[in-house]
Interface confidence: low
């Protein structure tokens, strides 16, 4: 393995070996080795042992290697909304008089117009709009399932608000279900959460588009506010390229530090797409803070400086106890833009573009 | 700003302006700029603004600078674990035949024991063991709040099992509460959650250590599986060196390669405490993978190199179009171990320690 | 139990002031403490509090960056630093200990209070 | 601004029964936080007089009682005495801001 120069692996063990020498004694705060002498000799308490079993369990649990994200998460997305079902559509007839929830429907065949292959879809959300509303409430959604079953999704516990709000819920695994399966109608259940003694379960929370007093308002202003799905996708001919093979790749962490420090921190960079790229084809935004990484990282030698001061520096400069610590971004977020190809414009979203933070690892 | 050679700002701009150039084209999957000629004058369709607001207030609301984490976080966590109340006690009285529901009371003195100060909390879940089950039940946890009252905390959905297991929930927030109010009984309700229109809503799991059966059986054995708190904690002596000022730290992501991959990827390194740093101290375990990252990233010319085949490298080796990418630590998982201090054995978990996949950044 | 602030008196904006709060008849270095203002004719304004190894210290939004509360635990004192003092910052200010180790939920003894004035 | 909501002003007759309210939100009072009372007689310090939303402090006579629901927190006096006139306020930790905040305060005037 080379970079630019040779790589002597050994090392680069032995740096990262006693990094780790520092890093361990650094987050315990010892100075050096705690003394041996006054150690019971046997094996350890049972008491012990359980307590550092639960712990090892939880880390095992909680860690257990995430899915990895496929190749295709690095490119752009394209955005649609679909609207639900009309509320003058018979299909709601039944669902009138249910005092403890509101019904939403959807056609399929409008989903699959927008993604036409399940795998395309990389995130689906539900947004209702709710009026304002003076009332706390905890609200549960659920998905159709079969004929006369529904399918817990999610809650919310929604305090009283004095303007609209709009309410977001993660549904990418039902609509990709949605998708495999053949077209129809599916739908959302948004409930009252009922308790198991209380005898008022009703539905306090009104959402645009739904609720009974509002039902006749269905003009475009209406429209925009009703119930939607907002979906991201890639499309179909950019799909092509994509490989099965999944591969892994970054997404989001924690971060950085004032913009008077030498060492590694964020720095401002604002890209303007015309004079920076001379691009006159992004119509929205016109620009946007990229940002980038700089500063130096030193790598610390704890060999011979097992003390206080240096092993306090660990946590600021090499906190994952690198071999060679290096400034990078540490948490991105992604740009929205709106383009055209030929005349129909396209709002796709770039992952990954701004550089909120940066971090020595 | 310097590292080890003068860095010329202008050209790091100007190498992060045309990565970005790159990024953007690589994730349209475009080989130039689309041609602007046949674009309709005028502004944008109201839809079209319409998706390209929904799209952004969804960045914006996903986004929002996340709680920067204290930098208590670097340092190792005491891990503790405190026991529900035991059910002979008058307290479980009045809650005996209630069908929906079970109750686990904690004595807040106890907790206040392990983790004398709230800000010294890091994570506390509440660990409680299920014992095998054929039915599946859709469950809810709820915290005591006031006389009559209780606060949602958050459901699962348990699926028949075979074997006893472990259901954990993270309860940080409400042993802070704990820990900021007066010392007394607090408790928890572990309910079947009740259906809007079942009228069966009877608790079907059983817990260990509470279901009614097992009640005579409190030995040893069994207090190792009752319910209890998993408490993780800055110890107050380690916590005095600790500046109240925050800065934030990395966490998690996602990832790797092959091991054959010649660029940046995980490189396996086992460290064994004994052998490699020279400590009998540390009791438990023996020792880890560490492993650490290693391999080129090259930076990628896009300004006159715009065609697929290099587009097509930034995914790998640039993601995040940066002006000199580097191999550094993508996920990271801690790291429990055992010592002792005199007499006393302390199990403490190491955050960030164990390095699970590299990324160019 | 008593609680007795010293350090008021009259300073110039942009000045700095540090208020002293000599504690006794409990176990200060197990308690949460706090310090809480009112300007005259003024409702009362919490302004900070500190756990009781000053491990912690939480500050109102209006003071933040200009008060250091700090302990010293074997001279049973708590202490307001107060720097770039405004006109706005006059007020009776009380020490008070803490109905908890945090010093957030509320407190149950209050000092006398002393009054800082700032005027040019 | 006050982040709890007070009445400015009550009054009431030796004997009656007066209610102070103050008003919240889901980060103060509604997010189970426990509130306190205070009483500060004209001139003097503050004294605490409930804590724990509804524990009354030492020495406090059972006339004052508190009480909660929701958001919205009540002290409660009863046989009101001339000796209750004096200015109340509510405090509650808030998890929003991270620190303590005080109603604005209810001047009872005892007529």
């Known amino acids: 393995l080379s970079t630019c120069k040779t790589i002597d692996m050994e090392l680069v063990k032995r740096k990262r070996i006693e990094a780790i020498r520092g890093q361990i004694l650094s987050k315990l705060r010892l100075a050096s080795p705690p003394s041996q002498g006054e150690v019971p000799p046997g094996p350890l308490p049972e008491a012990v042992l359980a307590l550092y079993n639960s712990t090892r369990d939880r880390v095992a649990g909680e860690s257990a290697d995430p899915e990895p994200e496929p190749e295709a998460d690095y490119y752009a997305k394209e955005v649609t909304r679909v609207l639900m079902v009309d509320r003058n559509n018979a299909i709601y007839e039944k669902t009138k008089d249910i005092s403890h929830s509101i019904y939403m429907f959807f056609n399929t065949s409008d989903i699959r117009e927008a993604v036409p292959e399940p795998p395309l879809l990389s995130r689906a959300e539900l947004r209702l709009q709710r009026l304002k509303s003076s009332v706390e409430q905890h609200v549960e959604l659920y998905q159709k399932y079969s004929n006369n079953s529904w399918r817990y999704l999610g809650n919310r516990l929604l305090t009283p608000t004095d303007t609209p709000e709009w309410l977001s819920f993660d549904v990418t695994g039902v609509v990709r279900q949605w998708l495999n399966a053949g077209d129809g109608i599916q739908g959302f259940r948004f409930s009252a959460h009922c308790s198991c003694d209380s005898k008022d379960n009703k539905l306090h929370v009104e959402i645009n588009g739904i609720s009974p007093k509002r039902r006749g308002d269905l003009g475009t202003i209406h429209d925009m506010n009703r119930p939607f799905l907002l979906l991201m996708a890639t499309p179909l001919e950019r799909a092509q390229h994509l490989h099965s093979s999944r591969h892994r790749r970054a997404l989001d962490t924690n971060y950085c530090f004032s913009s008077t420090e030498k060492n590694c921190c964020v720095r401002q960079l604002y890209i303007d797409f015309r004079k920076d790229l001379g691009w006159k084809w992004i119509h929205e935004p016109k620009g946007y803070h990229a940002n980038f990484c700089l500063g130096p990282c030193p790598y610390i030698w704890s060999l011979d400086t097992q003390y206080s001061k240096v092993l306090a520096l660990y946590n600021q400069h090499n906190p994952g106890a690198s071999a060679s610590p290096c400034c990078v971004p540490q948490a991105l977020e992604p740009l929205p833009i709106v383009y055209y190809v030929g005349r129909k414009p396209k709002v796709e979203q770039l992952s990954n573009m701004i550089v909120r933070s940066c971090k020595c690892s | 700003l310097s590292t080890c050679k003068t860095i010329d700002m202008e050209l790091v701009k100007r190498k992060r302006i045309e990565a970005i150039r790159g990024q953007i084209l690589s994730k349209l999957r475009l080989a130039s700029p689309p041609s602007q000629g046949e674009v309709p004058p005028g502004p944008l369709p109201e839809a079209v603004l319409a998706l390209y607001n929904s799209t952004r207030d969804r960045v914006a609301g996903e986004s929002a600078d996340p709680e920067p984490e204290p930098e208590a976080d670097y340092y190792a966590k005491e891990v503790t674990r405190v026991l529900m109340v035991d059910r002979n006690n008058a307290i479980y009285e009045k809650t005996k035949d209630i069908s929906h529901s079970i109750y686990m009371f904690f004595n807040t003195s106890d907790i206040r024991e392990a983790v004398p100060e709230p800000p010294l909390l890091s994570r506390a879940e509440l660990r409680l063991q299920r014992l095998k089950s054929s039915v599946e039940q859709h469950v809810e946890l709820y915290q005591k709040y006031s006389n009559n009252s209780w606060r949602y905390l958050g459901n699962r959905l348990l699926t028949p099992t075979d074997t006893p297991e472990w259901l954990s929930f993270d309860v940080t927030g409400v042993v802070r509460q704990w820990l900021n109010a007066g010392d007394g009984i607090q408790g928890f309700r572990f309910s079947a959650h009740c259906s809007c229109d079942s009228k069966d809503n009877k608790l079907h799991v059983e817990i260990n250590g509470i279901s009614p059966k097992r009640r005579g059986d409190l030995g040893t054995i069994h207090d190792m599986n009752r319910p209890f708190l998993l408490l993780m904690a800055t110890p107050l002596e380690r916590a005095q060196h600790l500046h109240s000022s925050r800065h934030r730290r990395a966490l998690d992501t996602n990832y790797c390669f092959s091991s054959t991959e010649k660029n940046c990827c995980v490189r396996q390194l086992y460290i064994d405490f004994r052998k490699d740093l020279g400590w009998k101290w540390i009791h438990e375990p023996k020792g880890y993978h560490a492993n650490f990252c290693l391999g080129p990233c090259p930076y990628i010319w896009s300004l006159d190199t715009q065609y697929s085949k290099v587009l097509a490298l930034y995914n790998q080796h640039n993601p995040g179009a940066s002006a000199s990418p580097c191999c550094v630590p993508q996920a990271l998982e801690p790291l429990p171990i055992v010592y002792y201090v005199g007499r006393k054995p302390k199990v403490e978990q190491l955050s960030n320690m164990i390095v699970r996949s590299c990324k160019c950044s | 139990l008593q609680l007795v602030e010293s350090g008021g008196g009259l300073v110039q904006p942009g000045g700095s002031l540090r208020l002293s709060c000599a504690a006794s008849?409990?176990?200060?270095?197990?308690?949460?403490m706090a310090w809480v203002r009112q300007a005259p004719g003024k409702g009362l304004e919490w302004v900070s509090a500190?756990?009781?190894?000053?491990?912690?210290?939480y500050y109102a939004n209006s003071v933040k960056g200009r008060v250091t509360m700090s302990r010293d635990n074997a001279k049973n004192t708590l202490y307001l630093q107060m720097n770039s003092l405004k006109s706005e910052d006059t007020a009776v200010y009380y020490c008070?200990?803490?109905?908890?180790?945090?010093?957030?939920?509320?407190?149950?003894?209050w000092g006398k209070g002393t009054l800082v004035t700032v005027s040019s | 601004q006050s982040v709890l909501t007070q009445l400015s002003s009550m009054s009431g007759s030796p004997g009656q029964t007066v209610t102070i309210t103050c008003t919240g939100s889901s980060s103060n009072i509604g997010g189970g936080y426990y509130l306190s009372w205070y009483q500060q007689l004209p001139g003097t310090a503050p004294k605490l007089l409930i804590y724990n939303t509804n524990n009354r402090a030492s020495g406090v006579p059972n006339r004052f009682s508190g009480s909660k629901t929701g958001s919205l927190a009540s002290l409660t006096i009863t046989g009101l005495q001339a000796e209750d006139e004096a200015d109340y306020y509510c405090g509650c930790y808030d998890d929003s801001l991270n620190t303590y905040v005080f109603g604005g305060g209810t001047k009872l005037t005892v007529l």
């Open positions: 008070a200990k803490g109905l908890v180790s945090s010093g957030l939920n509320g407190m149950d003894y």
């Open positions: 500190i756990t009781p190894g000053g491990t912690a210290t």
């Open positions: 008849g409990f176990t200060f270095s197990r308690s949460g």
